[in-house]
């Protein structure tokens, strides 16, 4: 397994609709044709696998139908969007990139993007 550099923003604030987007950029050492991107979440001692997609270079990322993630790729950049976030989902979201084919296998893990999610305040009842 060979190491690869992965860059991602340090902090992102989710929108009031619970959507957060960030770019994950990797320094590809070769001409990979098959790339796997995984988003992991770390909060205290819990590390969970949020979503993953494998794509062929030049093609779209395909996440599972029920995934909370969507994304697009452009060269060595992956634009990731996570939706349906609530305040309890605040945490460090780590971008992990694997160059699956052709060999050799490369693995890169970003330092993580701290995503802050603030639940919107309910609208106060108003009398007209």
């Amino acid at each position: 397994c060979k190491a690869m550099h992965v860059a991602q923003p340090a902090v992102v604030l989710a929108s009031s609709r619970g959507i957060a987007s960030f770019v994950c950029e990797y320094a590809s050492p070769g001409k990979a044709t098959e790339v796997r991107v995984t988003v992991l979440r770390q909060a205290d001692s819990q590390v969970t696998e949020v979503c993953a997609a494998t794509y062929m270079m030049g093609n779209e990322l395909t996440f599972l139908d029920d995934s909370i993630c969507t994304g697009t790729s452009s060269g060595n950049q992956v634009n990731l969007t996570i939706q349906g976030l609530r305040a309890m989902d605040t945490g460090l979201y780590i971008c992990k990139v694997e160059l699956m084919y052709p060999p050799p296998y490369y693995l890169g893990i970003g330092n993580g993007t701290q995503i802050y999610v603030i639940d919107p305040e309910p609208c106060p009842d108003s009398d007209f």
């Epitope: 995984t38 205290d44 969970t48 696998e49 993953a52 599972l64």
Partner: antibody, heavy 120, light 106 residues
Framework: EVQLQQSGAEVKKPGASVKVSCKAS????????MDWVRQAPGASLDWIGN????????SYNQKFKGKATLTVDKSTSTAYMELRSLTAGDIAVYYC?????????????WGQGTLVTVSS | QIVLTQTPLSLSVSPGEPASISCSAS?????MHWFQQKPGQSPKSWIY???ILASGVPDRFSGSGSGTDFTLKISRVEADDAGVYYC?????????FGTGTKLELK
């Protein structure tokens, strides 16, 4: 070389407590979570919980809340799991385990296991 | 919690023959991880992130699947492959393991 050395087998009476240790070596102890897994005789594996040695924050399987308590001693790079109010249902081999790389190769390293027997 | 059900519970295979173990999740998971355990030994990481072989695992083994259905395959079983195989998920807490599949050689 990463090594997780667990304490020896224990025989306890019902209602007693036991503290199992897991001494880590070959890496920076505070860099990785330590997880604990139970295996009752002839049964599958059951995740008990984990501890972040750096922050000492813990996460437990609801099934083991009130039964297991996870702690660490950073000065000796040792993780501990205490089981209280032991019953025959707690008879099992208990393992400590650690991930391979950070965020990759989950549970790549395992201790040799500690057999806890409960008998009057 | 996510329940992982493995099939078959046990299988007996002749050396050189293929073998397949399935792991079905009660709800969708991102990846499946597999462990091998021999009698009296600690489990060993065998396949992680669905398809990546752990260090030292022969390439006769492969892992595949997505969503709720995952498979561990052995192209040609050898004597040393005997043991119990467990699947595990890390998509949501509590982390859970499969029921286990015992592989024996004929």
């Amino acid at each position: 070389e990463v090594q997780l050395q667990q304490s020896g087998a224990e025989v306890k009476k019902p209602g007693a407590s036991v503290k199992v240790s897991c001494k880590a070596s070959g890496y920076t102890f505070t860099d990785y979570n330590m997880d604990w897994v139970r295996q009752a005789p002839g049964a599958s594996l059951d995740w008990i919980g984990n501890i972040n040695p750096n922050s000492e924050s813990t996460s437990y399987n609801q099934k083991f809340k009130g039964k297991a308590t996870l702690t660490v001693d950073k000065s000796t790079s040792t993780a501990y799991m205490e089981l209280r109010s032991l019953t025959a249902g707690d008879i099992a081999v208990y393992y400590c385990t650690r991930d391979g790389n950070r965020y990759d190769a989950w549970f790549a390293y395992w201790g040799q296991g500690t057999l806890v027997t409960v008998s009057s | 919690q996510i329940v992982l059900t493995q099939t078959p519970l046990s299988l007996s295979v002749s050396p050189g023959e293929p073998a397949s173990i399935s792991c079905s999740a009660s709800s969708s998971v991102t990846y499946m991880h597999w462990f091998q355990q021999k009698p009296g030994q600690s489990p060993k990481s065998w396949i992680y992130s669905t398809s990546i072989l752990a260090s030292g695992v022969p390439d006769r083994f492969s892992g595949s699947g997505s969503g709720t259905d995952f498979t561990l395959k052995i192209s040609r079983v050898e004597a040393d492959d005997a043991g119990v195989y467990y699947c595990q998920q890390r998509t949501s807490y509590p982390l859970t393991f499969g029921t286990g599949t015992k592989l024996e050689l004929k």
